[in-house]
Interface confidence: low
């Protein structure tokens, strides 16, 4: 079935809507569970076979400021010994998140929603042989 | 809230953060970058601790479909191919912003909504508890 | 089609050991996992543990690590748990469920095996 | 663990009835939830599962929806052959866990 987009629905406009301008929309940024925490296992970035460190990037201009960011430690992946297989790969896994960016055209201030792709963590792969013919 | 740096030309405004409600475009940045990640690699096949996708789909929410992670197994795939029991599988979770529609059903008001989603699975050494 | 199929009730002392069966057919058992549940009227249905019969590989869960061992038989299709040092608290009834684990799902269950101990 | 709290514990309907039935979850579950059925001499069968996924075969007067920590199963309308427990589970964490079950009697 048709999967609407912002701007659009299949629901019936109720008349309790807030009047917008055209080509725009109205976003409260007062976030919804802003308090909820992430309840991950413990420590599984340094646990993983393919483990990760994590980067904070910080944007003044951009909500929320803070993105945090992963990168994989390794090419390949940690065995049983603790060293390195390079016969496996650590590979990042993404995930889209959206920000609220601001923008400064002279004096004046506009908000333009993007979307963000940060990567969360690594797992570990086979990789995939390509036969040279 | 955040603080901006002021661009001293301008007229002089207290509120350094961002408003509580801004009006936004209705084009999204980067809108069309790919998000089935059923398509966008195979590593939920391919890993040691593989996981199925979730079509979760709510049109109160942009975006409304969200693919939702969930581990195979409680344990790893060893080289034999066998799930290997004294390693775990956990689930990567990840809060991301999504965007609520708020009066319901409105079609140009939203409020921005944290969710925890599952996104991957890593293979982990266990924590072992020894009991005194 | 899928079934499972249990073995009988079990009247036995406290302190004894047993070993209850569950036969499965309709399917390649080394597939799919095996878990076992125990029900009681009291702390209603407990998740005991699992078992892929493909490699022998368990886990379980803490409060029956001492108390259930899950084992099966590829030949005979069959998955057992044995339950060791039996008390009254042990008196349940105990299902076999099968683990779609590709889906990530229980699907079919089988009858239940009601164990009494009792002196 | 997780913590299932299911209510109510008893339905007393009619058929006819529509009947709803809420799991709790004590930490967020995802869709990883599934709800069976229990007839009286019978296995447990599998009715939804992924929260809102309605299982092969199952009438559609057996629906149920939610995510996280909140979800509700239903029965648009109740008929004789519905008498059974009805209980909750959740597939998202080891160990997994059931809720306490509602029994469903036809008046």
């Known amino acids: 079935r048709k999967i609407p987009k912002v701007g659009h629905t299949f629901f019936q406009k109720p008349e309790s809507c807030p009047p917008v301008p055209g080509g725009s929309m109205k976003l409260d940024i007062g976030i919804i569970n802003e308090n909820q925490r992430v309840s991950m296992s413990r420590n599984i970035e340094s646990r993983s076979t393919s483990p990760w460190n994590y980067t904070v990037t910080w944007d003044p201009n951009r909500y929320p400021s803070e993105v945090v960011q992963a990168q994989c430690r390794n090419l390949g992946c940690i065995n049983a010994q603790g060293k390195e297989d390079i016969s496996m790969n650590s590979v990042p896994i993404q995930q889209e998140t959206l920000v609220v960016r601001r923008k400064h055209q002279g004096c004046s201030v506009s908000f333009q929603l993007e979307k963000v792709l940060v990567t969360v963590g690594c797992t570990c792969v086979t990789p995939v042989i390509h036969h040279v013919q | 809230g955040i603080t901006i740096p002021r661009n001293p030309g301008c007229p002089n405004s207290e509120d350094k953060n961002f408003p509580r409600t801004v009006m936004v475009n209705l084009n999204i940045h980067n809108r069309n970058t790919n998000t089935n990640p059923k398509r966008s690699s195979d590593y939920y096949n391919r890993s040691t601790s593989p996981w199925n996708l979730h079509r979760n789909e709510d049109p109160e929410r942009y975006p409304s479909v969200i693919w939702e992670a969930k581990c195979r197994h409680l344990g790893c795939i060893n080289a034999d191919g066998n799930v290997d029991y004294h390693m775990n599988s956990v689930p990567i979770q990840q809060e991301i912003l999504v965007l609520r529609r708020e009066p319901p059903h409105c079609p140009n008001s939203f409020r921005l909504e944290k969710i925890l989603v599952s996104v991957g699975c890593t293979c982990v050494t266990p924590i072992v508890h020894h009991v005194a | 089609q899928v079934q499972l199929q249990q073995s009988g009730a079990e009247l036995v002392r406290p302190g004894a050991s047993v070993k209850l069966s569950c036969k499965a057919s309709g399917y390649t058992f080394s597939d799919y996992e095996m878990h076992w549940v125990k029900q009681t009227p009291v702390h209603g249905l407990e998740w005991i543990g699992v078992?892929?019969?493909?490699?022998?590989?368990?886990a379980y869960n803490q409060k029956f690590r001492d108390k259930a061992t899950l084992t099966a038989d590829k030949s005979s299709t069959t998955a057992y748990m044995e339950l060791s040092s039996l008390t009254s608290e042990d008196s349940a009834v105990y299902y076999c469920i099968r683990f779609l684990t590709y889906e990530g799902y229980f699907d079919y269950w089988g009858q239940g095996t009601t164990l009494t101990v009792s002196s | 663990s997780i913590v299932m709290t299911q209510t109510p514990k008893f339905l007393l309907v009619s058929a006819g009835d529509r009947v709803t039935i809420t799991c709790k979850a004590s930490?967020?579950?995802?869709?990883?939830v599934a709800w069976f059925q229990h007839k009286p001499g019978q296995s447990p069968k599998l009715l939804i599962n992924y929260a809102s996924n309605r299982y092969t075969g199952v009438p559609d007067r057996f629906t149920g929806s939610g995510y996280g920590t909140d979800f509700t199963f239903t029965i648009s309308t109740v008929q004789s052959e519905d008498l059974a427990i009805y209980f909750c589970?959740?597939?998202?964490?080891?160990?997994?866990?059931f809720g306490g079950g509602t029994t469903l009697e036809i008046k």
């Open positions: 078992i892929h019969p493909g490699n022998g590989g368990t």
């Open positions: 930490q967020s579950v995802n869709n990883d």
């Open positions: 589970q959740q597939d998202y964490g080891s160990p997994y866990t």
